[in-house]
């Protein structure tokens, strides 16, 4: 059974992940809009189900494409270092989902834009955090 200290650690990691995802979303939305349309041509794959930490496998598998799209947005209006940010997210995701159990991600039929994708995972983090508090 999870201890209060492990629950607290999970909560902090989720909050950190949430902040990182929100930072990316804010960076995109602040990026000279609608030059954003160039980024919106990219499609991302969404989880069929995202209710448990193991479902973060679906996020992990989309981190490389996310980094590639964020690299497009490098400009004086967009202060993000994609490699560092994605690396940080990857570390948190690996810790949260655990590496012992192998989970095969199932993707939904519908694909999403980068904005829809980020909003989906932000909602996931908020949902899990609310169950821990």
């Amino acid at each position: 059974a999870p201890t209060s200290s492990s629950t607290k650690k999970t909560q902090l990691q989720l909050e950190h992940l949430l902040l990182d995802l929100q930072m990316i979303l804010n960076g995109i939305n602040n990026y000279k809009n609608p030059k954003l349309t160039r980024m919106l041509t990219f499609k991302f794959y969404m989880p069929k189900k995202a209710t448990e930490l193991k479902h973060l496998q679906c996020l992990e598998e989309e981190l490389k494409p996310l980094e590639e799209v964020l690299n497009l947005a490098q400009s004086k209006n967009f202060h993000l270092r994609p490699r560092d940010l994605i690396s940080n997210i990857n570390v948190i995701v690996l810790e949260l989902k655990g590496s012992e159990t192998t989970f095969m991600c199932e993707y939904a039929d519908e694909t999403a834009t980068i904005v829809e994708f980020l909003n989906r995972w932000i909602t996931f983090c908020q949902s899990i955090i609310s169950t821990l508090t």
Epitope: P34, K35, T37, M39, L40, T41, K43, L72, T111, T113
Partner: antibody
Amino acid sequence: EVQLVQSGAEVKKPGESLKISCKGSGYNFDTYWIGWVRQMPGRGLEWMGTIYPADSDTRYSPSFQGQVTTSADKSISTAYLQWGSLRASDTAMYYCARFSSSAYDIWGQGTMVTVSS
Amino acid sequence: SYELTQPPSVSVSPGQTARITCSGDALPRQFAYWYQQKPGQAPVLVIYKDTERPSGIPERFSGSSSGTTVTLTISGVQAEDEADYYCQSADSSGTYHVFGGGTQLTVL
């Protein structure tokens, strides 16, 4: 009403220069990419390039890089496509189109360019 | 340079279903868009983001995507649907847009 209105048909001789226009109305012209598309007689659509009027950021298809120039004057909501020296092979219909998050959603009526000696 | 491949022509009887495919290596990561062009007219957007239909486009037009292929489906084809159809997308970097070669839909 959101629309793009293009300049009229042109008949030119090989070697002459030309600048055709595309005027936007009914929306904030500055903040949407404008694309240019060529359609040679009886052929398909070819993407030439795009321009972002707010800062004149441009992208060209490798096939058209160096062959044409796109520009924009945001003060009069107009985009331009120009040639320094026309060839007979430039004979085609040229369309401008607005690129939004839902693709090329608004198209001009087209400008027919005929190059013949 | 990046290419999108479409069949040159598709023929279908009125009331039947027409399917037009478009293949390209970047399509698993780039959305596709479909345009209808009738003779002497400018193209009209009929499907965006693989599957979305703009307002004013009949429900019989739909889009789907699987791997490197996207498909435009016209259910219950009508005579007025006879036109050229073009898919459009971007290369893997999102820098260059490209159109497929076009498919001529003939309603028998």
